[in-house]
């Protein structure tokens, strides 16, 4: 058993049929010595008396808010949560496996630049009685500070018969130099509590590996005389690290119709303009990637050909 | 300890091309190592990230773009003095700071070159003959060093009398390649910045 926060405790249980469970001793936070009784949740049934209560925690029915009273007055609470371990593996029932970039990916994180700011998100099908708490640091043995905000519900989607909820959190490394060469990864820890179930999820990464620039901005077309070719120009996204001559991007320019299976014109360039062949009912799209360290491409910025 | 904006004329900057070749060569070599040593811990997640130049050179700080010198987190207190001549410094206008930056890059390359050559000598003794360093990568390091053209004492190649542990050598190769790739990215950014200034 360990303390998650004040008056909230996590009991770690090996979860298998007829498991013996864990013996837990609760102590009432009071100077009083006698006349103390214990109840669980909203029940008025007295579970025991005395300053301490010893319980055998085996299942979710044994978890919950234990309260000690004296003469009708509440003295203190202890909330017990369960953390299940099945076949030596901690449960991951609360969050959905995003399977990208690999299996067992519950947290995904992205950074728009090298400023030390990043966003992580996760998915669940659970809609109520759900809380998240996020901590982060650079390195684990001698951790350096990363400050995370509160996790918020950022999107809701319908997937078949199920509703899927996306939560996200923004974090900022306390003293980040965009030009630094990272040698210690960022660690992100998410505590998830659903009713009386506790789970924790972690992710470890270098900012350089989660970079995904915003799409290029201000796409403009200039038709070339006596030709089917069009000059397309654009600018670096505002959120990208500066100076741009140091943090350079490379671009992919594509002309394609509505269907992905349609024919296309595609060219890669380090410049902020390119010449392509425009077709009726097609769109010109441009995306960006760090020129020197190949992490993710940005989403496409598009303009119609016509 | 930063790069001023008044740097050489773009046409006078021969190191950009060499630095691009360097990044390409080390990336290819790292990819080859990952594939060949698939049963060794050789991915970014599996290895310890070590920097053999730590406390010996200060490339990131010495080559910091002017725009980032206002960022206190970028200003490390490490001071290192370097020899200040070189053919990438294509004009007399070139500041002492830029010379410091380029000589720091030169020292990085020299250190990695020695490590890679020592390692290659060990790998050549491996009866499995599983992996060797790409001669192209070694040649590209050499070309960039020549383009930088700094006078500096030669670092003797480390020779070891004991029987090499090939497993450890291959893991060290992965660690070195990962670190060198990160440094090659920094070098490429620096050269691009200098070329554009």
């Amino acid at each position: 058993i360990w303390e998650l926060k004040k008056d909230v405790y996590v009991v770690e249980l090996d979860w298998y049929p007829d498991a013996p469970g864990e013996m837990v001793v609760l102590t009432c936070d009071t100077p009083e010595e006698d006349g103390i009784t214990w109840t669980l949740d909203q029940s008025s049934e007295v579970l025991g008396s005395g300053k301490t209560l010893t319980i055998q925690v085996k299942e979710f029915g044994d978890a919950g808010q234990y309260t000690c009273h004296k003469g009708g007055e509440v003295l203190s609470h202890s909330l017990l949560l369960l953390h299940k371990k099945e076949d030596g593996i901690w449960s991951t029932d609360i969050l959905k496996d995003q399977k990208e970039p690999k299996n067992k990916t519950f947290l995904r994180c992205e950074a728009k630049n090298y400023s030390g700011r990043f966003t992580c998100w996760w998915l669940t099908t659970i809609s109520t009685d759900l809380t998240f708490s996020v901590k982060s640091s650079r390195g684990s043995s001698d951790p350096q500070g990363v400050t995370c905000g509160a996790a918020t519900l950022s999107a809701e989607r319908v997937r078949g018969d199920n509703k899927e909820y996306e939560y996200s959190v923004e974090c900022q490394e306390d003293s980040a130099c965009p030009a630094a060469e990272e040698s210690l990864p960022i660690e992100v820890m998410v505590d998830a509590v659903h009713k009386l179930k506790y789970e924790n999820y972690t992710s470890s990464f270098f900012i350089r590996d989660i970079i995904k620039p915003d799409p290029p901005k201000n796409l403009q077309l200039k038709p070339l005389k006596n030709s089917r070719q069009v000059e397309v120009s654009w600018e670096y996204p505002d959120t990208w690290s500066t100076p741009h001559s140091y943090f350079s991007l490379t671009f992919c320019v594509q002309v394609q119709g509505k269907s992905k299976r349609e024919k296309k014109d595609r060219v890669f360039t380090d410049k902020t303009s390119a010449t392509v062949i425009c077709r009726k009912n097609a769109s010109i799209s441009v995306r960006a990637q760090d020129r020197y360290y190949s992490s993710s491409w940005s989403e496409w910025a598009s303009v119609p050909c016509s | 300890r930063n790069l001023p904006v008044a740097t050489p004329d773009p046409g006078m900057f021969p190191c950009l091309h060499h630095s691009q070749n360097l990044l390409r060569a080390v990336s290819n070599m790292l990819q080859k190592a990952r594939q060949t040593l698939e049963f060794y811990p050789c991915t970014s997640e599996e290895i310890d990230h070590e920097d053999i130049t730590k406390d010996k050179t200060s490339t990131v700080e010495a080559c910091l773009p002017l725009e980032l010198t206002k960022n206190e987190s970028c200003l490390n207190s490490r001071e290192t003095s370097f020899i200040t001549n070189g053919s990438c410094l294509a004009s007399r206008k070139t500041s002492f700071m830029m010379a410091l930056c380029l000589s720091s890059i030169y020292e990085d390359l020299k250190m990695y070159q020695v490590e890679f050559k020592t390692m290659n000598a060990k790998l050549l003794m491996d009866p499995k003959r599983q992996i060797f360093l790409d001669q192209n990568m070694l040649a590209v390091i050499d070309e960039l060093m020549q383009a930088l053209n700094f006078n500096s004492e030669t670092v003797p190649q480390k020779s070891s009398l004991e029987e090499p542990d090939f497993y450890k050598t291959k893991i060290k190769l992965c660690i070195l390649l990962h670190a060198f790739r990160i440094r090659a990215v920094t070098i490429d950014r620096v050269m691009s910045y200098l070329n554009a200034s």
Partner: antibody, heavy 118, light 107 residues
């Protein structure tokens, strides 16, 4: 399986024209760009131009502009390349090639040898 | 027009050994570079697109690298069927242009 089958070898006199055909099978004809390139004996490849069979749009290499015409007949899934004012240096194997990507070629015809000789 | 220069023009290699072919562009072409294999009397066959992207059905011993002006096609271990002429082609701008070819011969 996508295939491009070209017409047979031709012998032409200087000053005349030649029209080489390229019949496509497998896949929808208008879903691909179709290009023509040529290779003179012992020489490298030379790109001549492309056509979008969907709308008849064409683009030619400046070297051949005014002398080459590329057309396409969607009903027969056939593309044609006509080269006029032939000279002896036009002696080459002419290839058609196609791709959904405009700028490179993933399927090629077998080639047609055009000999220009007096 | 962008001029593509291949080297060497002829490359003698022992079967089973690796081979590297170089292609240089007269100006920067990013990664807009494609590699083909051509055997005598046959049409070219696409091996690599955009400098390093493998093509389905092409053996994994063929790999490409490079960007800007310098590109390399590598065959990790030459098989008897790999002895042929290899061509590079730029797609950075029209007109599309090819290298003059590198003939890989049995040593």
């Amino acid at each position: 399986q996508v295939q491009l089958v070209q017409s047979g070898a031709e012998v032409k006199k200087p000053g005349s024209s030649v029209k080489v055909s390229c019949k496509a099978s497998g896949g929808t004809f208008s879903d691909y760009y179709l290009h023509w390139s040529r290779q003179a004996p012992g020489q490298g490849l030379e790109w001549m131009g492309w056509i979008d069979p969907e709308n008849g749009d064409t683009e030619y290499a400046p070297k051949f502009q005014g002398r080459v015409t590329i057309t396409a007949d969607e009903s027969t899934s056939t593309a044609y390349m006509e080269l006029s004012s032939l000279r002896s240096e036009d002696t080459a194997v002419y290839y058609c090639a196609r791709n959904k990507e405009l700028r490179y070629f993933d399927v090629w015809g077998q080639g047609t040898l055009v000999t220009v000789s007096s | 027009d962008i001029v593509m220069t291949q080297s060497p023009l002829s490359l003698p290699v022992t079967p089973g050994e690796p081979a590297s072919i170089s292609c240089r562009a007269s100006q920067s072409i990013s990664i807009n570079l494609h590699w083909y294999q051509q055997k005598p009397g046959q049409a070219p066959r696409l091996l690599i697109a955009f400098a390093s992207q493998s093509i389905s059905g092409v053996p994994s011993r063929f790999s490409g690298s490079g960007s800007g002006t310098d590109f390399t096609l590598t065959i990790s271990s030459l098989q008897p069927e790999d002895f042929a002429t290899y061509l590079c082609q730029q797609s950075n701008s029209f007109p599309l242009t090819f290298g003059q070819g590198t003939k890989v011969e049995i040593k």
